[in-house]
Interface confidence: medium
């Protein structure tokens, strides 16, 4: 599923991401935009043999199990394919674990490079939340 901007903002808010670990909803929507272009089925392969999955591009080396990433830790204890569902529950729950891990949203390269320090509230402007 490819979410609309406000549709995703509403879904993320429903799942409790607004101000989760101090990150406003705009940060999460911005991260999703530049990680996956709001596409729940996005997959991207990395040079280390791992793959990033879903709307928040969660990595198979650390967070989920895709059955083919050597040394996968599967810290979210889920199959990576669960992160590709049109229901973003699994991605949100895993993202909460990731953002609590110590580096905050710096874990997402796209957030670090495209969202951090910008007017992230623009990503939810005009949305009825």
């Amino acid at each position: 599923k490819v979410f609309g901007r406000c549709e995703l903002a509403a879904a993320m808010k429903r799942h409790g991401l607004d101000n989760y670990r101090g990150y406003s909803l705009g940060n999460w929507v911005c991260a999703a935009k530049f990680e996956s272009n709001f596409n729940t089925q996005a997959t991207n392969r990395n040079t280390d043999g791992s793959t990033d999955y879903g709307i928040l591009q969660i990595n198979s080396r650390w967070w989920c199990n895709d059955g083919r990433t050597p040394g996968s830790r599967n810290l979210c204890n889920i199959p990576c394919s669960a992160l590709l569902s049109s229901d973003i529950t699994a991605s949100v729950n895993c993202a909460k674990k990731i953002v609590s891990d110590g580096n905050g949203m710096n874990a997402w390269v796209a957030w670090r490079n495209r969202c951090k320090g910008t007017d992230v509230q623009a990503w939810i402007r005009g949305c009825r939340l």
Partner: antibody
Framework: QVQLQESGAEVMKPGASVKISCKAT????????IEWVKQRPGHGLEWIGE????????YYNEKFKGKATFTADTSSNTAYMQLSSLTSEDSAVYYC?????????WGQGTTLTVSS | DIELTQSPATLSVTPGDSVSLSCRAS??????LHWYQQKSHESPRLLIK???QSSSGIPSRFSGSGSGTDFTLSINSVETEDFGMYFC?????????FGGGTKLEIK
């Protein structure tokens, strides 16, 4: 136990298309990548590409882009590979395998012969 | 693409001999190297994964070693059922690639 069952041998004319199937049993089909591999005598094994059935995500070896197209039907636990604009170079045995990085589980292979 | 070069192309041995098959990668692939056996008109069978981990049901006479770019499959005391083709494969990067194979034949 995990099994991959491929469709039977095909004899096709040059220029035609063919669709090979790979039915999976014994595991959760949607969560594992299915890989496709080509084997021609004297050419060893070549990786064609892969599909994740649960999402339809696909990746192709550059060499096979435009030649192979992958699809999957999660209701029947079956992956498909269509090969188009067939030439004699496409005559080979085609395998599906479960993509665990290494390939522990293989189909029995589908022999494709392209001949006028 | 990562090239895998296997040597020798053919190995003629007598049952009971011990042999080593080589696989060399064009660049480092860490430990992401796997070995397969293939007999005539059969699908490949995984023998060794990640350089040295035996696949389920594989006899203990098969072992693997190496790291980086140089890898070896060893067969301790070859049995008649071991004759056939052996391929290495890397899963370090895409596209996945295979070696050209080593044919193990009876002398």
């Amino acid at each position: 136990q995990v099994q991959l069952q491929e469709s039977g041998a095909e004899v096709m004319k040059p220029g035609a298309s063919v669709k090979i199937s790979c039915k999976a049993t014994g595991y959760t089909f949607s969560t594992y990548w299915i890989e496709w591999v080509k084997q021609r005598p004297g050419h060893g094994l070549e990786w064609i590409g892969e599909i994740l059935p649960g999402s339809g995500s696909t990746y192709y070896n550059e060499k096979f882009k435009g030649k192979a197209t992958f699809t999957a039907d999660t209701s029947s636990n079956t992956a498909y590979m269509q090969l188009s604009s067939l030439t004699s170079e496409d005559s080979a045995v085609y395998y599906c395998a479960r993509g665990d990085g290494n390939y522990c589980y293989w189909g029995q292979g589908t022999t494709l012969t392209v001949s006028s | 693409d990562i090239e895998l070069t296997q040597s020798p192309a053919t190995l003629s041995v007598t049952p009971g001999d011990s042999v080593s098959l080589s696989c060399r990668a064009s660049q480092s692939i860490s430990n992401n190297l796997h070995w397969y056996q293939q007999k005539s008109h059969e699908s490949p069978r995984l023998l060794i994964k990640y350089v040295s981990q035996s696949s389920s049901g594989i006899p203990s006479r098969f072992s693997g070693s190496g790291s980086g770019t140089d890898f070896t499959l060893s067969i301790n005391s070859v049995e008649t059922e071991d004759f056939g083709m052996y391929f290495c494969q890397q899963s370090n990067s895409w596209p996945r690639t295979f070696g050209g194979g080593t044919k193990l034949e009876i002398k």
